[in-house]
Interface confidence: medium
Amino acid sequence: MMTGTIETTGNISAEKGGSIILQCHLSSTTAQVTQVNWEQQDQLLAICNADLGWHISPSFKDRVAPGPGLGLTLQSLTVNDTGEYFCIYHTYPDGTYTGRIFLEVLESSVAEHGARFQIP
């Protein structure tokens, strides 16, 4: 029985040209994490495998950095990076847990404008 839950950073926004950390956390299970996949729609960005270590997709290696932890750092963001990201935890014996993050990359001026209206 799968008892675990994935907590994510949820819906996040970041400024064009900046960086963002995608984070997921698996809790409420004693299952062993054997691999974490980070995927964006139809593309796999990176894997962190217990045996193989980190492996970044060649097409993203200049803009994606592993970590912190099992998270993923996206750099030099463009508006095209807007969209859904999935953290996929392969565990034993539970199976697969998936978390979803929606990232919106904003033009610099929009991000600054929006910041004025954020509740502290």
Partner: antibody, heavy 120, light 113 residues
């Protein structure tokens, strides 16, 4: 263009070891995983394991854990598979493949295979 | 490990006929979170390494003729050749790439009458 060049056919004695090589060219060797697949004459495909040339990390099919050892030399862009304590069951063609796990494809590049024959 | 079971083990058809082969996995290859299916189909001709035909259960690899179609659910998958050609003589393998080890099915041998 991308190429995987494998070492030539081997005739080896039972109880000995053999090391098969897979030389990669036409791409950045550390950017892609290399996997190995076994095929006995007239039989199906068996997945042996995979190596991350960037980190040296490996993941094996449990069946081959005591049989195969995967290594990689980044300086020469060569992946190796050593098979130990050879028996007639190890007589097979061994393929290396560039493991492209990122959205557009899986294993688009394979080596031609190396025939290993174990015979007294 | 995920066990992949293919059927039939062989089939013989005439050129122009439609062919369907099956692959069943012992565990689901569907990730419910992103709705991806981690199943691939390969074609292997005598004396050659395998060639990727289909990935994601239904996406044709670049350059693969559109007579090859993959479909299926989380555990039951099908490869269909709509109109078999003489050059399709080969063994067809399915493969799990959901989790290590990336197990293959035992293959379906296609013969042309």
């Amino acid at each position: 263009q991308v190429q995987l060049q494998q070492s030539g056919a081997e005739l080896v004695r039972p109880g000995t070891s053999v090391k098969v090589s897979c030389k990669a060219s036409g791409y950045a060797f550390s950017d892609y995983l290399i996997e190995w697949v076994k095929q006995r004459p007239g039989q199906g495909l068996e997945w042996i394991g995979v190596i991350n040339p960037g980190s040296g990390g490996t993941n094996y099919n449990e069946k081959f854990k005591d049989k195969a050892t995967l290594t990689a030399d980044k300086s020469s862009s060569i992946a190796y598979m050593q098979l130990s304590s050879l028996t007639s069951d190890d007589s097979a063609v061994y393929f290396c493949a560039r493991f492209h796990y990122y959205g557009s494809s899986l294993f688009p590049y394979w080596g031609p295979g190396t025939l290993v024959t174990v015979s007294a | 490990d995920i066990v992949m079971t293919q059927s039939p083990s062989s089939l013989s058809v005439s050129a122009g006929e439609k062919v369907t082969m099956s692959c069943k996995s012992s565990q689901s290859l569907l990730n419910s979170g992103n709705q991806k299916k981690y199943l691939a189909w390969y074609q292997q001709k005598p004396g050659q390494p395998p060639k990727l035909l289909i990935y994601g259960a239904s996406t044709r690899e670049s350059g693969v003729p559109d007579r090859f179609t993959g479909s299926g659910s989380g555990t039951d998958f099908t490869l269909t050749i709509s109109s078999v050609q003489a050059e399709d003589l080969a063994v067809y393998y399915c493969q799990n790439y959901h989790r290590f080890p990336f197990t293959f099915g035992s293959g379906t041998k296609l013969e042309i009458k």
